[in-house]
């Protein structure tokens, strides 16, 4: 398929609430209408979707409801937010960019942000 | 083992319709992205066109568009062409074929083919 | 589109020959090229993809080589079910998905 340039951070330090936000950029070759933004999960040597949304260039992104992603977009960025992250989840997170429509189909994957989410420390109890 | 079964071709009238299907085992059908390919007598392997593993998107040949219509089922593993106002340039044996979608690299190429149908359009 | 120009329409051979079949691309397909075979009456069989890798259940003796637009389908030694018609096909720039018209492998 015909390969795009995608950019995304190196690094981002999930909230301690669990939130990690980073930006998605993709050098479009041509008008799309309609792009497909996949956030993959690279652990060892497997590769998994975490999330997948589409738009329509000028709209804003459908994520499923039950989806853990958010996100906007504004011409050539998207604005990805991933919630609900502990520190299990650390790990390489992939931007992957689809345009669909028009043809031809265009894909590109970024290098990968390495998010880092560290559990907060549970609240000692205090005696008064 | 893998099996791709096509169905439904035959002899119709230029103007009139047609439903091809295509029964999918020994695979995950809902993981691959399925195409029809024609192949007129005597002729080359002509691309007609891809419904997306999950169906959420289709691409057709010029040749085809406004025509035919690809569609699925994964709960039934069946692919479908509906091919309206036939001519009889169509007259082809008609193959579908799968192409795994790499979650890195998009559609691939295809690796598993039916055996075929005919269809001829002749009035 | 991108057309795909195959050479030679057909090339005969003794068994036992090395066979060497050409596909052409009207521009760069990169790496995303993929030679079948067909036998009458038959579908068509994936032999190479992305140029170079053999797909399953392919004997060692069918190599594929090239990037761009220039690309080689070698049969090392020509075995009897050999004999068939040879695609190449792209998958760089789609839709449409673009084969070339094919090369008639026969015995000589």
């Known amino acids: 398929c015909k390969a795009m340039h995608v950019a995304q951070p190196a690094v981002v330090l999930a909230s301690s609430r669990g939130i990690a936000s980073f930006v998605c950029e993709y050098a479009s070759p041509g008008k799309a209408t309609e792009v497909r933004v996949t956030v993959l999960r690279q652990a060892d040597s497997q590769v998994t979707e975490v999330c997948a949304a589409t738009y329509m260039m000028g709209n804003e992104l459908t994520f499923l409801d039950d989806s853990i992603c958010t996100g906007t977009s504004s011409g050539n960025q998207v604005n990805l937010t991933i919630q609900g992250l502990r520190a299990m989840d650390t790990g390489l997170y992939i931007c992957k960019v689809e345009l669909m429509y028009p043809p031809p189909y265009y894909l590109g994957i970024g290098n990968g942000t390495q998010i880092y989410v560290i559990d907060p420390e549970p609240c000692p109890d205090s005696d008064f | 083992q893998v099996q791709l079964v096509e169905s439904g071709g035959g002899v119709v009238q230029p103007g009139r319709s047609l439903r091809l299907s295509c029964a999918a085992s020994g695979f995950t059908f809902s993981s691959y992205g399925m195409h029809w390919v024609r192949q007129a007598p005597g002729k080359g392997l002509e691309w007609v066109a891809l419904?997306?593993?999950?169906?959420?998107?289709?691409y057709y040949a010029d040749s085809v568009k406004g025509r035919f219509t690809i569609s699925r089922d994964n709960s039934k593993n069946t692919l479908y062409l509906q091919m309206n106002s036939l001519r009889a340039e169509d007259t082809a044996v008609y193959y579908c074929?799968?192409?795994?979608?790499?979650?890195?690299?998009?559609?691939?190429?295809?690796?598993?083919w039916g055996q075929g149908t005919l269809v001829t359009v002749s009035s | 589109e991108i057309v795909l120009t195959q050479s030679p329409a057909t090339l005969s051979l003794s068994p036992g020959e090395r066979a060497t079949l050409s596909c052409r691309a009207s521009q760069s397909v990169s790496s995303y090229l993929a030679w079948y075979q067909q036998k009458p009456g038959q579908a068509p069989r994936l032999l190479i993809y992305?140029?170079?890798n053999r797909a399953t259940g392919i004997p060692a003796r069918f190599s594929g080589s090239g990037s761009g637009t220039d690309f080689t389908l070698t049969i090392s030694s020509l075995e009897p079910e050999d004999f068939a018609v040879y695609y190449c096909q792209q998958r760089s720039n789609w839709p449409p998905y673009t084969f070339g018209q094919g090369t008639k492998l026969e015995i000589k």
């Open positions: 419904i997306w593993y999950d169906g959420s998107y289709t």
């Open positions: 992305d140029a170079s």
């Open positions: 074929a799968s192409a795994y979608y790499d979650i890195l690299t998009g559609p691939y190429y295809f690796d598993y």
